[in-house]
């Protein structure tokens, strides 16, 4: 007799997500010498450990300590370049640029990037029918608990003059609603981080408007200045040459605004 | 700009103990919780400690629970990690980071542990 199930409305686990999470971890640390002391078998061990057997709606920051403590690593607290809904000219960036930092460049990013998880109270199985929806369903939820915790460590992290990728061709260019609004923006430490720098990126060829001027833009500059960190803004007109221009900063054509 | 200086290390024998210390400035030392990680030769970065800016909570290692103290002074913007029954394995540079990790950028130059019979 099949057991009663929760059902929930998101998405269930990522098909053969503990071989996927230890792959990753393997390959990370193949990648990255100074991370190959890393046990990746604990790593897993404790990522398991923060939401197995754990009711999927109650998962708590305090559940994923022991895999922060697995994760620690160096971060040039400099070279942090936040994002947000433009995930993927990001990570091209941080490819070319290879000092610079998101957050799926770190271990703990880089094992969770795209993937979805949950478990079930009492039991040690993993859900692979749903999962919680954040809205639907619940915000303490096992993936989203994650991201909020990694990412308000990596927000604390950072010093100096910090940048973020923000998506110049949706409605809302800085949205209060996502990670990058509510969470990292309000854990830069003011005592470390000078200035943050927005970088927004257009999307159409033709597009030659001052998007810095969007009144989210305004907003976000607003919450930042009464945090008493420095705010600046740079219209990436065109990111397919910007992308170019950091691959070979000599080209004659990269000194014209792009 | 953040700063720090450790200090305090040295060649001591298993089972023996050290003190070492962190003196920090640049910032407001105690809204800060600050973390004590190491680094053995040919190893990667590894926390040992967190305390709060407060003092209040504390959080260690495995491998150090119940031989090393980590414990702070705001007043003299200083944070300090008692190491007791020292061991082999404990040979590190040790360093002291602002934050709770697991992103550490260490300012300091550390200081060298070796435990060595």
């Known amino acids: 007799v099949p057991r009663w199930r929760q059902q929930w409305s998101g998405p269930g686990t990522t098909k053969r997500f503990p071989e996927t999470v230890l792959a990753r971890c393997v390959k990370y640390t193949e990648i990255h010498p100074e991370m190959r002391h890393v046990d990746c078998q604990s790593v897993w061990d404790a990522f398991k450990g923060a939401f197995i057997s754990k009711h999927p709606c109650n998962i708590t920051e305090e559940d994923y300590q022991p895999l922060m403590k697995l994760g620690t690593q160096t971060v040039p607290c400099n070279k942090i370049l936040l994002w947000s809904r433009i995930k993927d000219l990001a990570h091209q960036f941080t490819q070319v640029q290879r000092d610079m930092f998101t957050l799926e460049d770190t271990l703990l990013g880089y094992l969770a990037d795209d993937l979805t998880w949950c478990g079930e109270f009492n039991t040690s199985k993993i859900n692979y029918q749903s999962c919680p929806d954040w809205r639907k369903d619940c915000s303490n939820n096992p993936v989203s608990v994650f991201w909020k915790t990694v990412s308000r460590r990596f927000a604390e992290a950072a010093c100096d003059v910090v940048h973020v990728m923000l998506n110049g061709s949706r409605s809302k260019i800085f949205d209060k609603n996502s990670t990058f609004g509510s969470v990292e923006v309000h854990n830069l430490q003011p005592e470390k981080v000078q200035t943050l720098e927005a970088w927004v990126i257009h999307g159409g060829r033709e597009d030659s408007r001052d998007l810095c001027q969007d009144p989210t833009i305004k907003e976000l500059e607003s919450i930042i200045s009464k945090r008493n960190i420095q705010f600046s803004c740079k219209n990436i007109y065109r990111p397919d040459k910007f992308l170019q221009c950091v691959k070979n900063p000599e080209d004659s054509s990269c000194t014209s605004e792009i | 700009e953040v700063q720090v200086l450790e200090s305090g290390g040295g060649l001591v024998q298993p089972g023996g103990s050290l003190r070492l210390s962190c003196a920090a400035s640049?910032?407001?030392?105690?809204?800060?919780?600050m973390s004590w990680v190491r680094q053995a030769p040919g190893k990667g970065l590894e926390w040992v400690s967190t305390?709060?800016?407060?003092?209040?909570?504390?959080d260690y290692a495995d491998s150090v629970k119940g031989r090393f103290t980590i414990s702070r002074d705001n007043s003299k913007k200083t944070l300090y990690l008692q190491m007791n029954s020292l061991r082999v394995e404990d040979t590190a540079v040790y360093y002291c980071?602002?934050?709770?990790?697991?992103?550490?950028?260490?300012r300091g130059q550390g200081t060298l542990v070796t435990v060595s019979s």
């Open positions: 980071a602002d934050g709770r990790g697991p992103f550490f950028d260490y």
């Open positions: 640049g910032f407001t030392f105690s809204n800060f919780a």
């Open positions: 305390i709060s800016g407060s003092a209040g909570t504390t």
